[in-house]
């Protein structure tokens, strides 16, 4: 039982670290810049990194892993016609 | 597709120029602006999606707005400078384009 | 960012020969996502490659592409007078987009 113990709270500490070592290797994504210069959509932050919380540098780098998917899609379309990949939300605006 | 609002403007005057399309659902299609400075080459400024957000090449972003209705694309040049005097290019994705629209920027 | 390096610039061959513009580019460029453009003065673009060496419809046989990564070329066979232009490669860049060569005029003797 005793192992048994032993093996869950391992199982628990390594999901936590799991998470602690990928919320840190996402800050480092965005503080190397990580998904380009290519700007897009409103209201991009250009706060220096150091003033951002935490919960502002999750959201700059899914909004510049937004922008690489995006600009990916793009190159896939117009630049080797794959129209599958097109973007086609008619009822978004 | 055809381009409009091309003209001789002063620097920093907003100029906004149209791109029409007929027979293109805008919803289907990237729409692409390229310009071209006299005698140079062709220098890619950014895209619009379907769903309305825009792209920009990073020496672009802050000087240009691209923007979208049912039928037609703008862009908009925020604050032009002689720099920007350049036939402005409209294309559906990248194989169809419009003639050009000259715009010349001087004081 | 890429950097797109067109060469020769100008090039010249007689009608029916064969002229060939190589694209460096300074990174690999996303998914072979390269292009080949013709324009003529007074006219815009026209797109005769896509990926690297799939010819758009409606394009002569005597254009093709080929390379892969960073080099990239454009063959122009039986040369013919209406070939005259000048030709621009277009890479897909993930940090800028669309990254344009600087172009290769072709003068048809």
């Known amino acids: 039982r005793r192992d048994v113990a032993h093996g869950i709270l391992n199982e628990a500490y390594r999901k936590v670290l799991d998470q602690l070592s990928a919320g840190k290797h996402l800050q480092s994504l965005v503080a190397r810049g990580v998904g380009g210069s290519l700007g897009g959509g409103a209201g991009d932050d250009a706060e220096p990194l150091s003033k951002r919380h935490s919960d502002g540098i999750f959201t700059d780098s899914y909004s510049r892993y937004r922008k690489q998917m995006a600009v990916k899609k793009y190159l896939a379309a117009v630049l080797g016609k794959r129209y599958k990949q097109r973007v086609k939300n008619k009822g978004r605006r | 597709v055809e381009e409009s609002g091309g003209r001789l403007v002063t620097p920093g005057t907003p100029l906004t120029l149209t791109c029409t399309v007929s027979?293109?659902?805008?919803?289907?299609?990237?729409m692409t602006w390229v310009r071209q400075a006299p005698g140079k080459g062709l220098e890619w400024i950014g895209f619009?999606?379907?769903?309305?957000d825009a792209y920009y090449a990073s020496w672009a972003k802050g000087r240009f707005t691209i923007s979208k209705t049912s039928t037609t694309v703008d862009l908009k040049i925020t604050s032009p400078t002689t720099e920007d005097t350049a036939t402005y290019f409209c294309?559906?994705?990248?194989?169809?384009w419009g003639q050009g629209t000259l715009v010349t920027v001087s004081s | 960012a890429a950097v797109l390096t067109q060469t020769p610039s100008p090039v010249s061959a007689a009608v029916g020969g064969t002229v060939t513009i190589n694209c460096q580019s300074s990174?690999?460029?996303?998914?072979?996502?390269l292009a080949w453009f013709q324009q003529k003065p007074g006219q815009p673009p026209k797109l005769l490659i896509y990926?690297?060496?799939k010819l758009e419809s409606g394009v002569p046989s005597r254009f093709s592409g080929s390379g892969s990564g960073t080099q990239f070329t454009l063959t122009i066979s039986d040369l013919q007078c209406d070939d005259a232009a000048t030709y621009y490669c277009?890479?897909?860049?993930?940090?800028?987009?669309?990254?344009f060569g600087g172009g290769t005029e072709v003068v048809v003797k």
């Open positions: 294309a559906r994705d990248l194989d169809l």
């Open positions: 027979g293109i659902d805008l919803n289907s299609y990237y």
């Open positions: 619009i999606d379907a769903g309305g």
């Open positions: 990174e690999s460029v996303y998914g072979n996502y």
């Open positions: 990926e690297a060496s």
């Open positions: 277009a890479g897909g860049d993930i940090s800028e987009g669309v990254a």
